[in-house]
């Protein structure tokens, strides 16, 4: 059995993903729990397995189809339903009718990796993932990169307004090891957030010259 | 500048067939939906049929079976074949187009088309 409050959130990665995170405040006792997704003019459903990830929260994958397919528009409403097994039967624990391209979360960036590097200056590029055709060129950045002695926390976010896949980190420190992170985000959507940070880069500068005055 | 152009539209008997055509013109932009709705004096405007990318078609129940629609991607035209028409069909008829513009969705109107059934 369940008590307490559960939150039911949801994101689409703009083709053939949703994600989906359910947080139960109550104990929940061993039992098999699902994310069903019914869309209200598609002739397919999908359901996905909700596996821990905290001692209070689940989360699982629905996959539509192939990643670069687009499965669904901005028009398409699609019903996700938490379920979990009650004996028998399955006891419906949350409901949410979900709009996708207005809770929008994309991919994150893939593929990261130096262009060029040089004692100051790193030059830096990246690929987008599964992200729709509808935005075109059309999606921001934000990056920032991790110093020495420092958290990531406390890094800068450097903004880039446009579909820039590329980046030149200026007045680094010779010989010094870093590390560049990358996210993105639609310009659609009234719930859309930010995508995953990108896999850390590791990268260090080139060494100053002997002899010359840095 | 975007631009609805709808046609088609007219008087037509009990039984008739009316084939009514909207073409979406301007700037540049995707659209990933096309459809109909009617007026008809006193209510809301209504959806008759639509159809989404992955050709994903949804229809008003007073129209099943009579009206079907039709979406060409490449022309960006949507057409809507009406049959067995009744007078309750009778209404003004509009396209709407939803579009993508520089990374966007925002729906478009056409300015109508009147559509007459007589007993």
């Known amino acids: 059995a369940v008590n307490g409050t559960s939150q039911f959130t949801c994101f689409y990665n703009s083709r053939a993903n949703i994600s989906c995170v359910w947080s139960q405040d109550g104990a929940l006792q061993d039992t098999s729990c699902q994310v069903h997704a019914w869309p209200d003019r598609r002739r397919w459903n999908q359901t996905c397995e909700l596996l821990p990830v905290s001692q209070a929260s689940w989360a699982c994958n629905l996959i539509l189809g192939a990643p670069d397919s687009q499965k669904l528009t901005t028009v398409d409403i699609v019903t996700l339903r938490v379920l979990c097994r009650e004996g028998v039967r399955w006891r419906v624990m949350a409901i949410q009718d979900f709009k996708p391209f207005e809770n929008l979360r994309l991919m994150a960036p893939i593929s990261l990796q130096v262009v060029h590097v040089e004692t100051h200056r790193c030059n830096i590029s990246w690929e987008i993932s599964q992200a729709s055709h509808y935005f075109e060129r059309h999606l921001e950045f934000e990056a920032r990169t991790l110093s020495p002695g420092h958290t990531w926390e406390e890094a800068p976010l450097l903004t880039l307004k446009q579909k820039q896949e590329w980046i030149c980190l200026e007045t680094l420190t010779p010989d010094t090891q870093y590390e560049f992170q990358v996210r993105v985000k639609p310009l659609q959507g009234e719930f859309t957030t930010w995508s995953p940070w990108s896999q850390p880069l590791a990268f260090r500068t080139k060494p100053a010259a002997l002899g010359k005055d840095t | 500048q975007v631009q609805l152009v709808e046609s088609g539209g007219g008087l037509v008997q009990t039984g008739g067939s009316l084939r009514l055509s909207c073409a979406v013109s301007?700037?540049?932009?995707?659209?990933?939906?096309m459809g109909w709705y009617r007026q008809v004096p006193g209510k809301q405007r209504e959806l008759v049929a639509d159809m989404a990318d992955g050709g994903s078609a949804k229809y008003a129940d007073s129209v099943k079976g009579r009206f079907s629609i039709l979406r060409d991607s490449v022309k960006n035209t949507v057409y809507l074949q009406m049959s067995s028409l009744k007078p309750e069909d009778t209404g003004i008829y509009y396209c709407?187009?939803?579009?993508?513009?520089?990374?966007?969705?925002?729906?478009?109107w056409g300015q109508g088309t009147q559509v007459t059934v007589s007993s």
């Open positions: 301007g700037s540049r932009f995707i659209s990933d939906v």
């Open positions: 709407k187009a939803g579009l993508w513009i520089a990374g966007r969705h925002s729906d478009y």
